[in-house]
């Protein structure tokens, strides 16, 4: 007698491993036999795919090679034509063991910068990732951490983070280790140990000793009044990641020396600088007491930015004073050309003031510095970039001659407004019409209800207050 | 000798106003800069509003701004903070403050000399 | 806007001891950053400008330093007198943060 078609082994859940064989038995008893079909997520798997293999009149479903993409649920349907078609399904899981799909590769990092070394896994169930360092597995902190994606992320980086570093992936059906990688961690050039200042007689042997470190190991250049040093012999060792380097000295004349470490990022350098004085003990003889006199400001460049008849010390230590003033403001003046208009007024004024020094009359005249944190302002808020251009200009020697090196003052080294008011000179140019600033950036996100120009933010990559550019 | 006075704090109502001043001597108020600085009872300092009077540039933290206003008047050597539609949290004792030299600089200078600070109190 | 994160954010010292506050930029900022120095009840004092001048008439003990966002406030021997709340405070051009205080008890 005709009999319906009823499934007697419904089918049930599959967990395979990837590329092993996974079956589904569908049983049915009916009369007359019954066309079995299968589907995949509700789409018929043809009878021709070669990926499967269908036996026993439609009952046995077989994937002859799991992918981890069969995951999914599998029916089959029975219809003899009598009474209705009926169905049962079943899901496959597709086991895997661990594998590392992104492994970690090698990373130079900047100390005190951020790093991630990528881990990213599949794998059912979900492995869990770990990391080892050296023979040991690492341990968490407020530093390092393994992200959700199995990746390695470590704030701050220090020098004792560089070092050898794997991933470990691991479920409950294996293990999977990534090839090791290296982290190596790159510190911006710094001084140890500056050179110090010395007061000496005419005609003695000085030694100016210098010791920096960084990684890669700094080289140390030396300055003398702003030149590169002509005479005078060096001598340099290395030893544990710090170059030491001693400039040994003739005296004839007071001089300021200055102690350059360099070391190079990828395409950008780092600096710090140190700065000494020689000065010899019988300079001040009478006779050459006046370093330089008042006189009244006859030049051109500076005209707009200097006081009306303005009284400037003019350095006697020049042929011409007039002249090779007037020539210093010129060269760096033209530097200013490219400058943002933002920089560029404050500049000429720090220029300015610099070149040409107020100059209190006197028996002897003396030069009025510019107040250190006029001096600050203009480099950190309205000349940021343009400074650390110029810096990185010196570094690279582009700069056609030295002359401009003695244009920019060292902020450092000027007196504070704090200490007495009336012994340095301030900047009166440093507030602006809005008119003239088409281009004023804007501030941070929380405007205030003044036009400021933008304080260096994290977001620019060409500047970093940090000893990379010591603006001191 | 440089001196800062504070005065006009008390109890007020939530929404209501107050008008802090602040009076200097021993310096002008045309020269420097003034700042107001709060602190909560057992918290930390909080910087409120600053003015330069000599460019009459005004700025103001975001959890005051369009309720407070920092102003100065130059004859009378004295700066003001006028405080409108109050909250509980503006609770603290305010004190003003004082830096060398125009707003680009006065970052630099710190503030070197502080009032004794006045007490608000916001509470229904 | 630029936070300043302060740590640690109270120490007990001896005196003697040498301390170390530091402060922490969330992002590049000028050298224009100060420390101060507040006892209970009473106004702040300026240590520090400039992120590391000695205002006039602080003792030399303490000193100020920057190694990139990180700003330094040490005392480099403890006295009585140093038993105070210490702040670091950043000035943008006007919008200035204050970092959350370190407390400096006896040990």
């Known amino acids: 007698l005709p009999k319906a078609p009823v499934i007697t082994t419904p089918l049930e859940t599959v967990d395979a491993l990837v590329e092993e064989v996974a079956t589904f038995m569908c049983a049915v008893e009916s009369y007359p036999q019954p066309e079995i079909s299968w589907t995949r997520n509700k789409i018929l798997i043809k009878l021709f795919d070669t990926r499967y293999s269908i036996r026993e009149n439609g009952q046995l479903l077989t994937i002859l090679s799991v992918e981890d993409s069969d995951d999914g649920i599998y029916c089959c349907t029975a219809n003899n034509g009598v009474g209705g078609a009926v169905e049962s399904c079943g899901a496959l899981q597709v086991k895997m063991k661990p594998k590392i799909t992104r492994p970690p590769i090698n990373v130079k990092i900047i100390e005190g910068l951020k790093a991630v070394l990528p881990c990213t896994t599949m794998g059912n169930p979900k492995p869990s990732v770990s990391w080892i360092k050296g023979d040991s597995p690492l341990r968490e902190n407020s530093r390092i951490a393994v992200l959700e994606s199995g990746s390695l992320r470590i704030h701050n980086v220090q020098k004792e983070d560089a070092g050898q570093y794997r991933c470990v992936a691991k479920n409950s059906l294996g293990t999977a280790y990534s090839k090791v990688v290296k982290l190596e961690v790159e510190v911006f050039a710094r001084i140890l140990r500056a050179p110090e200042s010395h007061n000496v007689t005419f005609g003695s042997f000085v030694t100016l000793h210098c010791t920096a470190t960084g990684i890669p190991v700094p080289t140390i250049t030396w300055i003398e009044n702003g030149n590169a040093v002509s005479s005078g012999s060096i001598q340099e060792s290395v030893k544990d990641r710090v170059i030491d380097s001693r400039l040994q000295l003739f005296i004839t004349k007071p001089g300021l020396y200055t102690c350059i470490a360099t070391n190079k990022h990828g395409e950008k350098f780092s600096t710090a600088k140190a700065a000494a004085t020689i000065s010899i003990a019988e300079w001040s003889k009478p006779q050459k007491d006046n370093k330089g006199y008042c006189a009244q400001y006859r030049g051109e460049v500076c005209n707009a930015v200097l006081a009306k008849d303005a009284l400037v010390f003019l350095n006697t230590s020049y042929a011409d004073p007039e002249e090779a003033q007037e020539l210093l403001v010129h060269t760096a003046w033209n530097e200013l050309k490219v400058v943002s208009p933002v920089c560029r007024p404050a500049a000429e004024a720090l220029l300015c003031n610099h070149i040409f020094q107020e100059c209190s009359p006197g028996v002897v005249p003396t030069p009025i510095p510019i107040c250190r944190e006029y001096c600050l302002a203009v480099k950190e808020l309205f000349c940021a970039k343009e400074w650390l251009v110029m810096e990185e200009k010196t570094h690279r020697g582009l700069y056609r001659s030295e002359m401009h090196l003695l244009s920019v003052p060292e902020c450092s080294k000027l007196p504070s407004m704090h200490w007495d008011p009336t012994a340095c000179a301030r900047l009166p140019h440093l507030d602006y019409n809005k008119e003239n600033l088409k281009t004023f950036p804007p501030m941070t996100s929380s405007k205030p209800s003044v036009d400021i120009p933008n304080l260096p933010s994290s977001s620019s990559s060409s500047f970093s207050v940090s000893p990379t550019y010591s603006m001191t | 000798e440089v001196q800062l006075v504070e005065s006009g704090g008390g109890l007020v109502q939530p929404g209501g106003s107050l008008r802090l001043s602040c009076a200097a001597s021993?310096?002008?108020?045309?020269?420097?800069?003034i700042h107001w600085v709060r602190q909560a009872p057992g918290k930390g300092l909080e910087w409120v509003a600053s003015?330069?009077?000599?460019?009459?540039?005004?700025s103001y933290a975001d959890s005051v701004k369009g309720r407070f206003t920092i102003s100065a008047d130059t004859s009378k050597n004295t700066a003001y903070l006028q405080m409108n539609s109050l909250r509980a949290e503006d609770t603290a004792v305010y004190y003003c403050?004082?830096?060398?030299?125009?707003?680009?600089?006065?970052?630099?200078?710190?503030?070197?000399?502080w009032g004794q600070g006045t007490l608000v109190t916001v509470s229904s | 806007d630029i936070q300043m994160t302060q740590s640690p954010s109270s120490l007990s010292a001896s005196v003697g001891d040498r301390v170390t506050i530091t402060c922490r930029a969330s992002?590049?900022?000028?050298?224009?950053v100060a420390w101060y120095q507040q006892k209970p009840g009473k106004a702040p004092k300026l240590l520090i400008y400039?992120?590391?001048s000695l205002y006039s008439g602080v003792p030399s003990r303490f000193s100020g330093s920057r190694s990139g966002t990180d700003f330094t406030l040490t005392i480099s021997s403890l006295q009585p007198e140093d038993f105070a709340t210490y702040y670091c405070?950043?000035?943008?051009?006007?919008?200035?943060?204050f970092g959350q205080g370190t407390k400096v008890e006896i040990k």
């Open positions: 403050a004082r830096s060398e030299g125009d707003r680009y600089v006065s970052g630099y200078m710190g503030f070197d000399y």
């Open positions: 021993g310096f002008t108020v045309s020269s420097s800069s």
């Open positions: 003015i330069s009077s000599s460019y009459g540039s005004t």
């Open positions: 992002q590049s900022v000028s050298s224009a």
């Open positions: 400039s992120a590391s």
């Open positions: 405070q950043q000035s943008g051009v006007w919008l200035i943060t």
